[in-house]
């Protein structure tokens, strides 16, 4: 025998109290698949969470984070604070990058400036807490006997830190 509940579509539940009639999900609840015996309570986006998508009878609400925070976890289960450029998030909040390190994003960690001398280059632009150094031509390229000056290397595009 076929289960009568299997005929209940998404957005309804199979109401055992009413001879297994398909009843609409009550307000603030949803069922995303057919044949459900209960509807799930809609997620509420409160506090630092804000509503990205309203709950409907067939799908849960989706949250994101208010400005100054970013999502972490499956389905934005957590909101982690942003820091300013030139800072990193520590266990005790946002802290300025130490001298010799930088962070050009609102999240991630402070990373060491590029060591231009490892590539035989000179520092063209000093680094800051927010920006990496820019390496210029090697000292040999700048010597009077050099036939031509190589153009400065473009600033290294740092990869994103793992979050």
């Amino acid at each position: 025998l076929q289960d009568p509940c299997s005929n209940c579509p998404a957005g309804t539940f199979c109401d055992n109290n009413r001879n297994q009639i398909c009843s609409p999900c009550p307000p603030n609840s949803f069922s995303s698949a057919g044949g459900q015996r209960t509807c799930d309570i809609c997620r509420q986006c409160k506090g630092v969470f804000r509503t990205r998508k309203e709950c409907s009878s067939t799908s849960n609400a989706e949250c994101d984070c208010t400005p100054g925070f970013h999502c972490l976890g499956a389905g934005c289960s957590m909101c982690e604070q942003d820091c300013k450029q030139g800072q990193e998030l520590t266990k005790k909040g946002c802290k300025d990058c130490c001298f010799g390190t930088f962070n050009d994003q609102k999240r991630g960690i402070c990373r060491p400036w590029t060591n231009c001398s490892l590539d035989g280059k000179s520092v063209l632009v000093n680094g800051t807490k927010e920006r990496d150094v820019v390496c210029g031509p090697s000292p040999a390229d700048l010597s009077p006997g050099a036939s031509s000056v190589t153009p400065p290397a473009p600033a290294r595009e740092p990869g994103h830190s793992p979050q």
Epitope: E88, K91, K92, I109, P162
Partner: nanobody, 124 residues
């Protein structure tokens, strides 16, 4: 697959106690430091406590120092948080998190796997 599953949350009166557990699977538990982090309804994530892979080093946020105790049982792949003298401001969803290194401290924020959380409500 790396998984963390918290339990032990609930409703407790101010001044009461709770013990949270976090069961880990999918990685060599003793090789990694672990942390507890919480999110209160109106706030972002707040670090609570961390413990090294061996359990020999522990660190606490000032807000919980002297009231909360972090511990681990590497033979059971389980992390614990004993919470005493609970206050209304401790109300939050508590997450356990795996860190990316064996050692830990109270500065570097390098959690890379999170549990789904357990809710602690402190209210009379």
């Amino acid at each position: 697959e790396v998984q963390l599953l918290e339990s032990g949350g609930g409703l407790v009166q101010p001044g009461g106690s709770l013990r949270l557990s976090c069961e880990a699977s999918g990685f060599t538990f003793s090789s990694y430091a672990m942390s507890w982090v919480r999110q209160a309804p109106e706030k972002g994530l707040e670090w609570v406590s961390s413990i090294s892979g061996s359990g020999g080093s522990t660190f606490y946020a000032d807000s919980v120092k002297g009231r909360f105790t972090i511990s681990r049982d590497n033979s059971k792949n389980t992390l614990y948080l004993q919470m005493n003298s609970l206050r209304a401001e401790d109300t939050a969803v508590y997450y356990c998190a795996k860190e990316g290194t064996t050692e830990t401290d109270d500065y570097h924020y390098n959690m890379d796997v999170w549990g789904q959380g357990t809710t602690v409500t402190v209210s009379s």
